[in-house]
């Protein structure tokens, strides 16, 4: 596990002629924020493909107003690093997309207007634990200067964050088969890193990131015992060969969260929601007040500054948690209607609508029939971003302009002959059949499967299909 860190140094006009106009003006002040998207390997994927390694958003930069007559300078940047945590091994090669977004603080009563100013992309090789790498990328007339690095989260070390380092148990040397951890010579390399949360008692790995179970244990983290005894109330899949599965201790069993924190299971581990005044992985850090500046991501601290007083953080848009430490994934609620693509910009949700739909949440079905006339008495039907005409009898085609051949589909059954008629079609039935489509056989004794024919119409007469 580790963190990819991106530091934006400047965003402004690139060298050479054709300097871009400032994105902000006295009439339309604005501010910038950045989004980074990481993908493993060196593949050149579409910008919309998932950020499999992770993604992050910056805070919003200071509000900027261009001074009349001044050239577009480097624009004021948001505070802090963009951090993309990764759970498993660092891949060594990766693709990145860095987007510069502009928020206009203009006259949009419904909220701010968002627009993508620039997007740069690249493919790089990078070893974890190395120094900051500096980069310059150009997008049109704009230039973005930034640095990046990947660092391992202790106790992981190495260029892929797959080795573990532990303090030495003996003062002089490491255990059998384990080397000293450079540059931490006072620590020893530990066995390779299994999948996060893999049971140390019942699981093992031969490759980084995997979790293979010892006999008698199962589950993705080898925490579920396989029981061959009969189950009174099986809660897992049961079979004659394996018996039934009894859920073993889950990551929240025994509540690892201290100080009244509540535990919730995550796919690979657990997460503590801490009460006010506590934070940390297990809510173990206490005695925090506003004087300690506990709120992340620009959150404002509310509450007493004295040690006995709890605090709360008022979080900026896009963040939540007792310390504003959690980014809100509002796209998980699937707010975009009618198949729209959701984009969480952190400070606002943006829905990219499919053709034929509009609105902040793609909730408006555009009037596909506006200005579209259906000929010959046809009526227009909306749907799916395209208009369709429901045509009157005898007409067809997209706009009901074509005279339809009602007999083209061979509607008369049992060898009946079809005749086009001004109001539809008429079937002349073969001997022994009757009905509008000649679908009913006439019984040998002369009776029919239908009620008596209407007066003046003998079985075998042409039946007009209305």
């Amino acid at each position: 596990a580790g963190v990819f860190e991106l530091q934006i140094h400047s965003f402004g006009p690139g060298p050479g002629p054709g300097a871009p106009r400032s994105p902000c003006s006295a009439r339309l002040p604005c501010r910038l924020f950045f989004r980074v998207c990481l993908k493993p390997g060196l593949s050149e994927e579409a910008a919309e493909s998932p950020c499999a390694l992770g993604a992050a958003l910056s805070a919003r930069g200071p509000v900027y107003t261009e001074q009349p007559g001044a050239p577009a300078p480097d624009l004021p940047l948001p505070d802090g690093l963009l951090q993309v945590p990764f759970r498993d091994a660092w891949p060594g090669t990766f693709s990145f997309i860095i987007e510069t977004w502009r928020e206009e603080l203009g006259d949009q009563i419904g909220g701010p207007a968002w627009s993508l100013l620039a997007r740069v992309a690249g493919r790089r090789r990078l070893a974890a634990g190395g120094p900051w790498a500096r980069d310059i990328q150009r997008a049109g007339a704009w230039e973005l200067r930034f640095s990046y690095r990947a660092r391992c989260e202790p106790p992981a070390v190495g260029t892929a964050c797959t080795r573990l380092c532990r303090p030495r148990s003996a003062p002089s040397r490491c255990g059998p088969g384990l080397r000293p951890c450079a540059p931490l010579e006072d620590e020893c390399e530990a066995p390779l890193v299994c999948r996060a949360g893999c049971s140390p008692e019942h699981g093992f790995c031969e490759q980084p990131g995997e979790c293979r179970c010892l006999e008698g244990w199962t589950g993705p983290l080898c925490t579920v015992p396989v029981s061959t005894s009969s189950c009174l109330s099986p809660r897992g899949p049961s079979s004659a060969t394996t018996g039934c599965l009894v859920p073993g201790p889950g990551p929240c069993d025994g509540n690892p969260c201290a100080n009244g924190g509540s535990c919730s299971e995550t796919p690979r581990s657990f997460e503590c929601t801490c009460p006010r005044g506590f934070y940390g992985l297990r809510c173990e850090v206490s005695g925090v007040t506003c004087a300690d500046g506990p709120c992340f991501n620009g959150g404002l601290c509310v509450g007493g500054a004295d040690p006995d007083s709890a605090y709360i953080c008022h979080c900026p848009p896009g963040f939540q948690g007792s310390n504003c430490e959690k980014r809100v994934d509002r796209c998980s609620l699937q707010p975009c209607r009618n198949g729209g693509l959701c984009l969480d910009l952190g400070h606002a949700l943006r829905c990219r609508c499919r053709a034929g739909f509009a609105g902040p949440r793609c909730e408006h079905d555009l009037d596909d029939c506006a200005g579209r006339a259906c000929a010959n008495g046809g009526t227009c039907v909306e749907g799916g971003g395209a208009h369709r005409c429901s045509c009157a009898l005898g007409f067809g085609g997209r706009d009901c302009r074509e005279r339809a051949d009602p007999c083209a589909a061979r509607p008369c059954a049992h060898g009946g002959r079809c005749y086009a008629h001004f109001s539809g079609l008429v079937c002349a039935c073969a001997p022994g059949y009757m009905g509008a489509r000649c679908e009913f056989p006439v019984h040998p004794d002369g009776a029919s499967a239908l009620p008596a024919a209407p007066p003046g119409l003998r079985p075998g007469d042409p039946q007009r299909y209305l």
Epitope: P62, L105, F296, H347, A348
Partner: antibody, heavy 119, light 112 residues
Framework: QVQLQESGPGLVKPSETLSLTCTVS?????????WNWIRQPPGKGLEWIGY???????NYNPSLKSRVTISRDTSKNQFSLKLSSVTAADTAVYYC????????????WGQGTLVTVSS | DIVMTQSPDSLAVSLGERATINCRSS????????????LAWYQQKPGQPPKVLIY???TRESGVPDRFSGSGSGTDFTLTISSLQAEDVAVYYC????????FGQGTKVEIK
Amino acid sequence: QVQLQESGPGLVKPSETLSLTCTVSGYSITSDFYWNWIRQPPGKGLEWIGYITYDGSTNYNPSLKSRVTISRDTSKNQFSLKLSSVTAADTAVYYCVYGDFNRHAMDYWGQGTLVTVSS
Amino acid sequence: DIVMTQSPDSLAVSLGERATINCRSSQSLFNSRTRKNYLAWYQQKPGQPPKVLIYWASTRESGVPDRFSGSGSGTDFTLTISSLQAEDVAVYYCEQSFYLFTFGQGTKVEIK
């Protein structure tokens, strides 16, 4: 351009409640920022009264907390100040101001409105 | 509460000369998580609302002339006007936003 405009009575009697409204144009008060009230007695310095955030959370100056309520009307894009049990010491120019989470700075100020407390 | 104290209360400087205003807080305004000092400087001209000049103790607001600069960390901060202009006559306030918001009492800058 974001604009803030204070409105309300210029004269309030002692012991009554001072009520002011700030009308915001050019930006939705539910999108971002914390929306503050700050006052300045004639010839004196600035005093922060409190704020309401884009999501409706409030925070007040401890010295005024027992008398202050800040609320909002999102349909009109307005936020309001109520200060109860006023005295002559509450005579001041009252400003509505928006603050930026990123910098924790008071970015943009209304022109201010003078409220006099007198019988 | 954090108390902000400015010095001097007033200052008379010749045009083109340097003006220096000091601000001291009763506790540190440095946030070790963000590596920022949450101190801002404001300028208020007669009959106008204040306007932000400097934030994070030393970052100049867009559009503010570069003769204005801020420095300092922790509890002691300084606003410097390197070459005073006639339009700089105003009252200057420091403000902390580390915990709640409090302003200094103000420093009046005049031309000598």
